[in-house]
């Protein structure tokens, strides 16, 4: 599949973020892998996500900057090829964004594709 596109971040509460994205084809056979990190981290933290194109991070440290990326594949249970897509562009959010009151809190994209 194509790499996920249009990553957006929403603030659900003071300490909770939701990441949303689009895939070129809406397909219930798709599954996703989200990686996130902060500027304090040495390694990505990873979370598998089902066909729903969203991921919630329930506990956010407002002093740190967070970066997310996502890739997708067809669920092996659907009998399709099991290769992961390329990574999406990264999405970064800072503590200044976290302090804002708007629902959409990150407009900053890295215009660089990431390969696995």
């Amino acid at each position: 599949p194509w790499a996920p596109e249009n990553l957006t971040l929403h603030k659900l509460s003071e300490s909770q973020l939701e990441l949303n994205w689009n895939n070129r084809f809406l397909n219930h056979c798709l599954e996703h892998l989200v990686q996130y990190r902060t500027d304090w981290d040495h390694s990505w933290t990873e979370q598998s996500v089902d066909y729903r194109h969203k991921f919630s991070l329930p506990s956010v440290d407002g002093q740190k900057r967070y970066t997310f990326r996502v890739r997708s594949r067809f669920n092996p249970l659907c009998g399709s090829a099991q290769h992961w897509s390329e990574w999406s562009e990264q999405k970064l959010i800072s503590e200044e964004d976290l302090g804002g009151e708007q629902k959409l809190i990150s407009e900053e994209d890295l215009h660089h594709h990431h390969h696995h």
């Epitope: 990686q35 500027d39 390694s43 990505w44 990873e46 900057r65 990264q90 660089h112 390969h115 696995h116």
Partner: antibody, heavy 116, light 108 residues
Framework: EVQLVESGGGVVRPGGSLRLSCAAS????????MSWVRQAPGKGLEWISS????????DYADSVKGRFTISRDNAKNSLFLQMSSLRAEDTALYHC?????????WGQGTLVTVSS | DIQMTQSPSSLSASVGDRVTITCRAS??????LNWYQQKPGKAPKLLIY???SLQSGVPSRFSGSGSGTDFTLTISSLQPEDFATYYC??????????FGQGTRLEIK
């Protein structure tokens, strides 16, 4: 005490292959993504590859993409770099380092010399 | 790719001096900036991460500051063991991870 010990370097002809290893101890290996960073004689540091905690995701510098493969064995606390189609410009001291993008611990390096 | 430029490339200083090394990114990297020290024949050592956070075990005379494109590493009072080469490294846009070209700190 944290230790990262590289091995497998040597002299190889252009077009040849080598497999580098890094033995880790003194920290919880599978809590860390791992990386290889090289340093040509008298030159600066160049990141070449990183792998995530479980080995499911890897990134490469354009200069080695398609020629080098990073892997790990968490059961043996080991990191590997399979290098093929070696070129003179790959001559360098190869360090393994803990972390995917922030390098907390480093090995002393193993020297790779590509020469005809 | 993001380019990292350090200045100066080399400098001479005396024990007890206050020394500042600067690192400039070719685009904003927020605070995704790390500093390393490397002595001849030795592996690099992480000094500062996230632009200003001191790595465990590193003396407090080392400090980092900056955000966006301009960063500094400051050694408040040089000690004999501080003469080495220092590298900055960005981890904002990855891959690739990129390092500065290094700053060689020599004894005057």
């Amino acid at each position: 005490e944290v230790q990262l010990v590289e091995s497998g370097g040597g002299v190889v002809r252009p077009g040849g292959s080598l497999r580098l290893s890094c033995a880790a101890s003194g920290f919880t290996f599978d809590d860390y993504g791992m990386s290889w960073v090289r340093q040509a004689p008298g030159k600066g540091l160049e990141w070449i590859s990183s792998i995530n905690r479980n080995g499911g995701s890897a990134d490469y510098a354009d200069s080695v993409k398609g020629r080098f493969t990073i892997s790990r064995d968490n059961a043996k606390n080991s990191l590997f770099l399979q290098m093929s189609s070696l070129r003179a410009e790959d001559t360098a001291l190869y360090h393994c380092a803990s972390g995917e993008f922030r390098f907390d611990y480093w090995g002393q390096g193993t020297l790779v010399t590509v020469s005809s | 790719d993001i380019q990292m430029t350090q200045s100066p490339s080399s400098l001479s200083a005396s024990v007890g001096d206050r020394v500042t090394i600067t690192c400039r990114a070719s685009q904003s990297i927020s605070s995704y900036l790390n500093w390393y020290q490397q002595k001849p024949g030795k592996a690099p050592k992480l000094l500062i991460y996230a632009a200003s956070s001191l790595q465990s075990g590193v003396p407090s005379r080392f400090s980092g500051s900056g955000s966006g494109t301009d960063f500094t590493l400051t050694i408040s009072s040089l000690q004999p063991e501080d003469f080495a080469t220092y590298y900055c490294q960005q981890s904002y846009s990855t891959p690739p991870i990129t390092f500065g070209q290094g700053t060689r700190l020599e004894i005057k």
